[in-house]
Interface confidence: medium
């Protein structure tokens, strides 16, 4: 911009707000208004008006002619199959015409399930707040992802934070410790397995507790890569109700076995 | 004709739950907002809750927050209210509304306004 | 206690002119639209008046509403026998996200 000798511009429709203010001095300073004609469309007040002729004090921004977001949509989770919705609100003081769109990872949804309506608030549309919802329907794992909302009208768009949708599956096992009855001296051997979305954490307890003696005589051995739970040289007070939970951001679920224990 | 109608009042014990249906006719349910109101008999009228005309956005009175669940089927053009934990206070005619909706250049315009009633149902929370 | 305040009964006689008024704050009268409601006696209400001072088609022009910062009015000209009824002002309250009533008036038309 230092080596600008000429800049034409000739527009009646400037919108002669607070954001306006700067453009007549930085011209006028760089000796580039002869080839502008520029003049107001909004407010009412200056509409007609040259930006030279309005006073700077006169740049304001008491409305809100643009779109401005008051209720963002929220980062969710949901469990596939569910049905979830986004919502997303802005106010404006225009009632020039409102457009709505969704992106999905900054892509805009060209079929989106949209609900878009306005309420009147206010009498002769001082401030309308217009609302756009989006309805995902039976969420699988293709619709997670980051959603914004685009609310756009004659002056601008304005752009809501990004939501973040999460799909999760409950855990469920895909096997389960069963009842056993073993000799002391011998090895315990309990199984449970689970899927999920994420992927489900297995913790075993015994009667209730995670402190038992077999745990703290490290007896106890789970195998990182295994669905197996093994207790090495078992003892009589090993005996119980032991408690397999597979646990993941959308839930728990536990499967109980009992361990009894025959003196050799 | 436009026309609701609704049903579902009776004596329910306090604590005690209800259902409330409100069925629509005569126009395009799926394109107006709804609203439930109250009125103790003699008394003053209550706003109780609204729902959009998607049933995506919902509000309700403080005083049946937690308690009361507003929701429509569409397909079905009714509106519904379930009543849970009431208490003797609830005890009133309850209305179903229509909120007032002008559509024009393909967007709906909302006011804060009921222009058809249904003629009331009456809850009564007894022991 | 209703949050938009009305007085709890007027009157007048056939053919007067009587004004309801309708008092509230800034969250709901002061930003937001007004509605005036009709109730005969043993039947639903009935929308008179929205968005401040609109009527909805079939109310008479006898029936008109307006509004100033955190107060509204209704006014009744040309009073009928059957305009005896109550009357409530509503608006939308931004504070409670709520629809707010007023307390009703009752008019008496001697």
């Known amino acids: 911009m230092k080596n600008l000798k000429e800049l034409h511009i000739s527009s009646d429709s400037f919108l002669c707000d607070c954001q306006l203010k700067w453009l007549p001095p930085w011209l006028i300073g760089r000796m580039l208004q002869a080839f502008v004609t520029a003049t107001c469309a909004h407010p009412e007040s200056l509409k007609g008006q040259s930006i030279f002729s309005v006073p700077p004090e006169s740049f304001v921004c008491d409305d809100f002619l643009k779109p401005q977001i008051i209720t963002q949509p929220e980062t969710t989770m949901a469990m596939v199959g569910k049905d979830i919705r986004f919502t997303c609100s802005a106010a404006s003081s225009s009632s020039s015409p409102m457009t709505f769109a969704w992106k999905k990872d900054n892509e805009v949804l060209t079929n989106a399930d949209m609900e878009n309506f306005v309420h009147v608030h206010a009498q002769d549309g001082e401030v309308m707040e217009y609302t756009t919802i989006l309805h995902l329907r039976q969420v699988t794992f293709g619709h997670e992802g980051r959603y914004q909302c685009v609310i756009t009208n004659h002056f601008g768009s304005t752009y809501s934070h990004k939501a973040r949708l999460t799909v999760n599956v409950l855990p469920s096992f895909t096997k389960t410790p069963h009842d056993i009855t073993i000799r002391t001296t011998t090895m315990a051997r309990l199984e449970c397995a689970a899927t999920g979305h994420p992927n489900p954490q297995i913790a075993w307890q015994k009667d209730g507790g995670t402190d038992f003696p077999a745990a703290r005589e490290r007896r106890m051995h789970v195998m990182p890569d295994d669905d197996v739970f093994f207790i090495t040289d078992v003892k009589i007070d090993d005996a119980g109700v032991y408690s397999c939970t597979a646990q993941n951001s959308a839930g728990s679920i536990s499967a109980n076995a009992t361990l009894t224990v025959l003196e050799t | 004709e436009v026309q609701l109608l609704e049903s579902g009042g009776g004596l329910v014990q306090p604590g005690g739950s209800l259902r409330l249906s409100c069925a629509a006719s005569g126009f395009t349910f799926s394109d107006y907002d709804m609203s439930w109101v109250r009125q103790v008999p003699g008394k003053g009228l209550e706003w109780v809750s609204w729902?959009?005309?998607?049933?995506?956005?919902?509000y309700y009175a403080d005083s049946v927050k937690g308690r009361f669940t507003i929701s429509r089927d569409n397909s079905k053009n009714t509106l519904y209210l379930q009543m849970n934990s009431l208490r003797a206070e609830d005890t009133a005619v309850y209305y179903c509304?229509?909120?007032?909706?002008?559509?024009?250049?393909?967007?709906?315009?909302?006011?804060?306004?009921?222009?058809?009633w249904g003629q009331g149902t009456l809850v009564t929370v007894s022991s | 206690q209703s949050v938009l305040t009305q007085p709890p009964s007027a009157s007048g006689t056939p053919g007067q002119r009587v004004t309801i008024s309708c008092t509230g704050s800034?969250?709901?009268?002061?930003?937001?639209?007004v509605t005036w409601y009709q109730q005969l006696p043993g039947t639903a209400p009935k929308l008179l008046i929205y968005?401040?001072?609109n009527r909805p088609s079939g109310v008479p022009d006898r029936f008109s509403g307006s509004k100033s910062g955190t107060s509204a009015s209704l006014a009744i000209s040309g009073l009928r026998s059957e305009d005896e009824a109550d009357y409530y002002c509503a608006a939308w309250d931004s504070s409670l996200s709520a629809y707010v009533f007023g307390g009703g008036t009752k008019l008496t038309v001697l």
């Open positions: 968005a401040d001072n």
């Open positions: 509304a229509r909120g007032l909706g002008l559509c024009k250049t393909g967007l709906c315009y909302y006011y804060d306004a009921m222009d058809v």
């Open positions: 800034s969250s709901n009268i002061g930003n937001n639209s």
């Open positions: 729902i959009s005309h998607g049933g995506g956005s919902i």
